[in-house]
């Protein structure tokens, strides 16, 4: 069973700057789960409010 949210292909191992790449199955695209203290589409910004 394919989940809705799983590992990214190897080509995107560096896609997320401060976080983990996850492949969104429904949208057919990679997305980033940011580490604590980071925000942005690719976790590229430090969260100044954190």
């Amino acid at each position: 069973v394919v989940s809705h949210f799983n590992d990214c292909p190897d080509s995107h191992t560096q896609f997320c700057f401060h976080g983990t790449c996850r492949f969104l199955v429904q949208e057919d695209k990679p997305a980033c789960v940011c580490a604590s203290g980071y925000v942005g589409a690719r976790c590229e910004h430090a969260d100044l409010l954190a």
């Epitope: 590992d7 589409a41 590229e44």
Partner: antibody
């Protein structure tokens, strides 16, 4: 998302050419930009991709010494430069972005001729 | 590099009939996450390629449901039912699993 490519180029053998691809309704820093080559009446070849957010590039081996990809995030534009042009480089060049290439530019025809 | 093979350079079809276009990969495109990273594109004459099918069997936005994709890890089929005149063009498969991404050589759909 729209990708607008620069106009057709007629260039001499041995010269270089720099093509552009400007995105609208989309921040190029949010995803990779890819370039493809299509020779007349031929198939598609993946040249490589650039990460506009940091300039990191990946090239297909055959284009490693021929192509240079760059990006300018202030103008939301990606560039492809081809050097030491020969007749083999006569082709339409496409930019495409996002996973699975749902968005393509209209293509730029480069003709290499003396 | 992963080699993508489209054995048939062209396929003739009568409008209203169905047609299948095949593609093979030299390596399985099934990722450990369960997704198969095989994509289909149509390039109409004088136009940029258009995404038809993503991850082997999923219909891209705005694409008629006359198009469908199927396959295994290395053998793939694009099926067009009730072919229309607007379907003419060259169909390409693409492996989106690993660098360098590679396309098949293309299969031209021609109306009889």
């Amino acid at each position: 998302v729209q990708l607008q490519q620069s106009g057709a180029e007629l260039v001499r053998p041995g010269a270089s050419v720099k093509l552009s691809c400007t995105a609208s309704d989309f921040n190029i820093k949010d995803d990779y930009m890819h370039w493809m080559k299509q020779r007349p009446e031929q198939g598609l070849e993946w040249i490589g991709r650039i990460d506009p957010a940091n300039g990191n590039t990946k090239y297909a081996p055959k284009f490693q010494d021929k192509a240079t990809m760059t990006a300018d995030t202030s103008s939301n534009t990606a560039y492809l430069q081809f050097s030491s042009l020969t007749s083999e480089d006569t082709a339409v060049y496409y930019c495409a972005t996002s996973w699975g290439f749902p968005y393509w530019g209209q293509g730029t025809l480069v003709t290499v001729s003396a | 590099d992963i080699v993508m093979t489209q054995a048939a350079p062209s396929v003739p079809v009568t409008p209203g009939e169905s047609v299948s276009i095949s593609c093979r990969s030299s390596k399985s495109l099934l990722h450990r996450n369960g997704n198969t990273y095989l994509y289909w594109f149509l390039q109409r004459p004088g136009q940029s390629p258009q995404l038809l099918i993503y991850r082997m069997s999923n219909l891209a936005s705005g694409v008629p449901d006359r198009f469908s994709g199927s396959g295994s890890g290395t053998a793939f089929t694009l099926r067009i039912s009730r072919v229309e005149a607007e379907d003419v063009g060259v169909y390409y498969c693409l492996q989106h699993l690993e660098y360098p991404y590679t396309f098949g050589s293309g299969t031209k759909l021609e109306i009889k």
